[in-house]
């Protein structure tokens, strides 16, 4: 069973407990498991998104190391994205009261997806450059082949920053993240703490 | 060139307060999420507080027990490190680090260190 | 927590020579690992990131290498300005993490 499934069954099972289970201060009981699962929602929901993070920033690495995977490799992370998309959607429509951090992932997301659409178009007009050139070097017409070379070259160079931006901006995204987490635990485990009888 | 200026340390007793300030210069501040780190007296590194480039996200050890406060300004490119209820375990040199120019490593470039020194 | 167990604590080599650091982590930290060069007095410089990137105005003689818990940090061919504390440290997950630190001294 999927842990957000998992999670929810706890919820329920906290909530509908009888009411014979529940020690004195029952709105203050409520409230703290309230927060729990609101703190166990913001938990997987940013487990999930620094998973595909860390997935896309493995992709671009590779991706860095050689310019002829460079378009399996857009393909590989725009599926990635489309995943983590897919998977926010879902968690989000099982823990509506997560609310915290949505605002923010969503740039994060737009912010990732705006500079994958920039790669992506730079590898089209890279790999048109690379047929174009192959074509004129086939033909021996040499003088325009090394002015294509050039042109090419520099859109290279643009890829190649491009996706050194991107980079970092993963590995930066994913640092905020494990960040949220390591916050949020840190309040859970206050909240428990705070929680235990004296 | 990039430089973090570390100042506000000095003698505290137990129990006092003191505001650490870390002065960027030569690169865009708000583009990078901040560090602190301590070292005290021959001993090893220490992690103490993380600040994402926008200032939302904070964290800290779970050593301060809520008694540290980490804030930015980007606007005067400045970090801060509010620290209370001192104490003893807590002198060292404290120092602001920037993350990696291409955004890799979040500890690259550090200021040179203020000195936080709690005794009675 | 993550432990970065570092070993030796400390080394005692001559000019010349190829000197090794290793560095283990006490669960996978993919290639998120930081080697630090820190001189009496002074801030810890940046040699080694992402596991085996050089940074920019580091001499070649320094070079990283490892991936998941195992690490380890060579300098081929030892110089009188190398003397000096180096120490690893992790940042797959918060608390970032170091190595205790190796005390490198020339015979």
């Known amino acids: 069973m999927p842990v957000p499934a998992l999670c929810l069954l706890w919820a329920l099972a906290m909530v509908t407990r009888p009411a014979s289970a529940a020690p004195m201060g029952g709105p203050e009981l409520a409230q703290h498991e309230e927060l729990t699962l609101l703190f166990h929602g913001t938990l997987q929901l940013g487990q999930a998104l620094n998973g595909v993070y860390r997935t896309t920033e493995g992709r671009l690495t590779k991706a860095r190391n050689s310019l002829g995977l460079y378009g399996r490799t857009i393909e590989l992370l725009g599926q990635e994205v489309s995943r983590g998309r897919d998977a926010a959607q879902e968690l989000r429509a099982s823990l509506l009261e997560t609310q915290m951090e949505e605002d923010i992932l969503q740039l994060q997301a737009e912010a990732t997806a705006e500079v994958l659409g920039e790669v992506a178009q730079a590898q089209k007009v890279l790999r048109d450059s690379v047929q174009r050139l192959e074509v004129q070097l086939r033909s021996a017409w040499l003088g325009p082949a090394y002015r294509e070379f050039e042109v090419l070259k520099a859109h290279a160079d643009k890829q190649s920053h491009i996706l050194w931006a991107l980079t970092g901006h993963v590995q930066r995204q994913r640092r905020e993240m494990v960040a949220q987490q390591h916050r949020l635990r840190q309040i859970q485990e206050r909240l428990h703490t705070a929680a235990l009888p004296a | 060139e990039v430089q973090l200026v570390e100042s506000g340390g000095g003698l505290v007793q137990p129990g006092g307060s003191l505001r650490l300030s870390c002065a960027a210069s030569g690169f865009t501040f708000n583009n990078h999420e901040m560090n602190w780190v301590r070292q005290a007296p021959g001993k090893g590194l220490e992690w103490v507080s993380y600040?994402?480039?926008?200032?939302?996200?904070?964290t800290y050890a779970d050593f301060l027990k809520g008694r540290f406060t980490i804030s930015r300004d980007n606007a005067k490119n400045s970090l801060f490190l509010q620290m209370n209820s001192l104490r003893d375990e807590d002198t060292a040199v404290y120092y602001c680090a920037r993350d990696h120019l291409s955004g890799t490593s979040p500890l690259s470039y550090w200021g040179q260190g203020t000195l936080v020194t709690v005794s009675s | 927590d993550i432990q970065m167990t570092q070993s030796p604590s400390s080394l005692s080599a001559s000019v010349g020579d190829r000197v090794t650091i290793t560095c283990q982590a006490s669960q996978d930290i993919n290639n998120y690992l930081n080697w630090f060069q820190q001189k009496p007095g002074k801030a810890p410089k940046l040699l080694i990131f992402d596991a085996s990137n050089l940074e920019t105005g580091v001499p070649s003689r320094f070079s990283g290498s490892g991936s998941g818990t195992d690490f380890t940090f060579t300098i081929s061919s030892l110089q009188p300005e190398d003397i000096a504390t180096y120490f690893c440290q992790q940042y797959e997950n918060l608390p970032y993490t170091f190595g205790q630190g190796t005390k490198l001294e020339i015979k």
């Open positions: 600040i994402s480039s926008s200032g939302n996200t904070v």
